[in-house]
């Protein structure tokens, strides 16, 4: 999916009001010095591409993020503010239902959510312009 035509400001507002708080809840008890951000993004569409990938695609050691509250709210925000996004996700959702697993918060998942916070932070940053 090409995130170029999303309403970035509306997504940002949704993130600040709810999604960010759910991410903090998920990370509660984790030290703020524990993880360095290694996943990066260069502009807002790219950030959303990386956020989608890290939130919804299972990875080795962390298969369960898509069922978390922050993930469901992320999906809703993208569906509302990115034209045509929900249609592209129908097949992906059906595939995900087939491989639903028990929720387990592993250290790998905590690291992945820390990376997500970093990607969202880059997405939210003001436009950094060289004067």
């Amino acid at each position: 999916y090409d995130f170029t035509n999303c309403d970035f400001e509306k997504i940002k507002a949704a993130y600040l009001s709810t999604i960010s708080k759910d991410l903090i809840t998920y990370m509660s008890g984790t030290k703020s010095t524990e993880f360095n951000n290694t996943v990066s993004c260069s502009n807002r569409p790219h950030c959303l591409t990386e956020i989608q990938s890290l939130t919804f695609n299972p990875t080795a050691g962390c298969a369960s993020l898509a069922k978390e509250m922050f993930a469901m709210k992320t999906k809703a925000a993208l569906a509302i503010w990115c034209p045509g996004y929900s249609e592209t996700q129908i097949n992906a959702t059906q595939a995900m239902k087939k491989r639903r697993k028990r929720k387990v918060t592993t250290n790998k998942c905590l690291e992945q959510v820390s990376q997500l916070q970093g990607l969202w932070r880059r997405f939210n940053r003001p436009l950094l312009k060289q004067q």
Epitope: E9, K12, A13, Y15, L16, S17, S20, I24, S32, T33, E34, F35, N36, N37, Q117, G118, W120, R121, R122, F123, N124, R125, P126, L127, L128, K129, Q131
Partner: antibody, heavy 119, light 107 residues
């Protein structure tokens, strides 16, 4: 807990340079931008610029372009702000601040460094 | 550069009063606005981000609203510790300019 500790007060002569340090602790230094803001006596807040400690990328207010240099030392988790060709109008308190978790504000601030420029 | 205009520049009020400070941006900044409180000799403290989100630990008597070019900070019932100077700052693009400040004084 997150802390930003700045260097002590400075007295400089016009034309000189000053380098203010901001030592960060309690968080992953390279994950967050650092902002520099100054405040002249009895005046409001004035935004000077931002540095990305990870990349070293800087974004300066036009007013300070050519006179300010922001750097960051990853090994010591310290940000620096150097201001050159000082004049009396540069007398102010200089603050560093850390970007918030969400990237939508600056949530932790240093205690401030007082600079006096006088002949 | 985006200019931020705050009003009033100073305001006298009493403990228990409801006060509202406004901030106007010279162009559309959506919801990219923060509010800070500053007391003499201290660093600013973050109150509100994203125009309406209260920073953790900030009392619920503070609230932010607005979007586009018009924003406000409201204190529903002034407490003695609220007498300070308040600044808005836009967060849309660099340079991240501040408002001119509003000094809230005891009547």
């Amino acid at each position: 807990q997150v802390q930003l500790v700045q260097s002590g007060a400075e007295v400089k002569k016009p034309g000189a340079s000053v380098k203010v340090s901001c030592k960060a602790s309690g968080y992953a230094f390279t994950n967050y931008l650092i902002e520099w803001v100054r405040q002249a006596p009895g005046q409001g807040l004035e935004w000077m610029g931002i540095i990305n400690p990870e990349s070293g990328d800087t974004y300066y207010a036009q007013k300070f372009q050519g006179r300010v240099t922001m750097t960051a030392d990853k090994s010591t988790s310290t940000a620096y702000m150097e201001l050159s060709s000082l004049r009396s109008e540069d007398s102010a308190v200089y603050f560093c601040a850390k970007e918030s978790l969400t990237g939508s504000s600056y949530d932790y601030w240093g205690q401030g460094t007082t600079l006096t420029v006088s002949s | 550069d985006i200019q931020m205009t705050q009003s009033p520049s100073s305001l006298s009020a009493s403990v228990g009063d409801r006060v509202t400070i406004t901030c106007r941006a010279s162009e559309n900044i959506y919801s990219n606005l923060v509010w800070y409180q500053q007391k003499p000799g201290k660093a600013p403290q973050l109150l509100v981000y994203g125009a309406r989100n209260l920073q953790s630990g900030v009392p619920s008597r503070f609230s932010g609203s607005g979007s586009g070019t018009q924003f406000s900070l409201t204190i529903s019932s002034l407490q003695p510790e609220d007498f300070a100077t308040y600044y808005c700052q836009h967060f849309y693009e660099t340079p991240l300019t501040f408002g001119t400040g509003t000094k809230l004084e005891i009547k």
